[in-house]
């Protein structure tokens, strides 16, 4: 899909920082999501994995932001080929991995 502008990505990073930095209890009650290959996948794949989580207000804004980065509607399981060895991880781990991935992209100047 199209590369989001730097300002939108900064806002997504700030939201992921906010979630990670202020997490006082297990995120989304410890819900599990598919681990994905972020390098090969991207925003639509990340959204696909998080689409399986419902009723978790803490990540609703992240889900909306990812939707804005993905050019088409994503349905759960659409990108199953990019799941990492059918591995599930906690949402907190997923958010952390996504945050570090985006931080790395920024550091490499890909979205500046």
């Amino acid at each position: 899909g199209p590369v989001p502008p730097s300002t939108a990505l900064r806002e997504l990073i700030e939201e992921l920082v906010n979630i990670t930095q202020n997490q006082k209890a297990p995120l989304c009650n410890g819900s599990m999501v598919w681990s994905i290959n972020l390098t090969a996948g991207g925003f639509c794949v990340a959204l696909d994995s998080l689409t399986n989580v419902s009723g978790c207000s803490a990540i609703e804004k992240t889900q909306r932001m990812l939707s804005g980065f993905c050019p088409h509607k994503v349905s759960a399981g659409q990108f199953s080929s990019l799941h990492v060895r059918d591995t599930k991880i906690e949402v907190a781990q997923f958010v952390k991995d996504l945050l570090l991935h985006l931080k790395k992209l920024f550091r490499e100047g890909q979205f500046n």
Partner: antibody, heavy 122, light 109 residues
Amino acid sequence: EVQLLESGGGLVQPGGSLRLSCAASGFTFSSYAMSWVRQAPGKGLEWVSAISGSGGSTYYADSVKGRFTISRDNSKNTLYLQMNSLRAEDTAVYYCAKADFWSGTLWGFDYWGQGTLVTVSS
Amino acid sequence: SYVLTQPPSVSVAPGQTARITCGGNNIGNKIVHWYQQKPGQAPVLVVYDDSDRPSGIPERFSGSNSGNTATLTISRVEAGDEADYYCQVWDSSSDHVVFGGGTKLTVLG
């Protein structure tokens, strides 16, 4: 080149006060969270306090809460630590440290000052 | 509050691999950073974000983090690597930065 230069350390009696300063240069100071970290003689690193880039959020170790105040003046590129009601156990080298990424306090400290020694003794 | 547990000391012969562990409850969900500190000097960041290396840090330094243990690995250890090493995380439940107690790496010989 990033530089952090602490000052304000010295000898103070128990119950006394000191204000440490950390002059920063070589980066956009207001974009980064900053922290104070201390090290008592022969001991490990102990985090003291942190402040967000804007100064709107501050955080303190339990051992200093209510006695120390962290602040920053982004117009002067300077970080401060006001230390009141000092105790012998506050004796340490105090380092200021810069977060390695904008937004938040999750990050490692990629630059440190050389430290300033605070000695609390009668 | 959150506790990070490091072995007080690790000894290794030159040219061998040193592994320094940092234990913490579900530390794999946290972002871990590692520092090297030599006597009389300020700490230096050697690994950040679990496994990334700042520029200027040799490739011999690497990090990993999963489950309840983060690990700093130093391959082909040199005499100059002798120092204290500290792990660090942000603990969101207490809004505190937390350091491990430190590990003294001794290079034998």
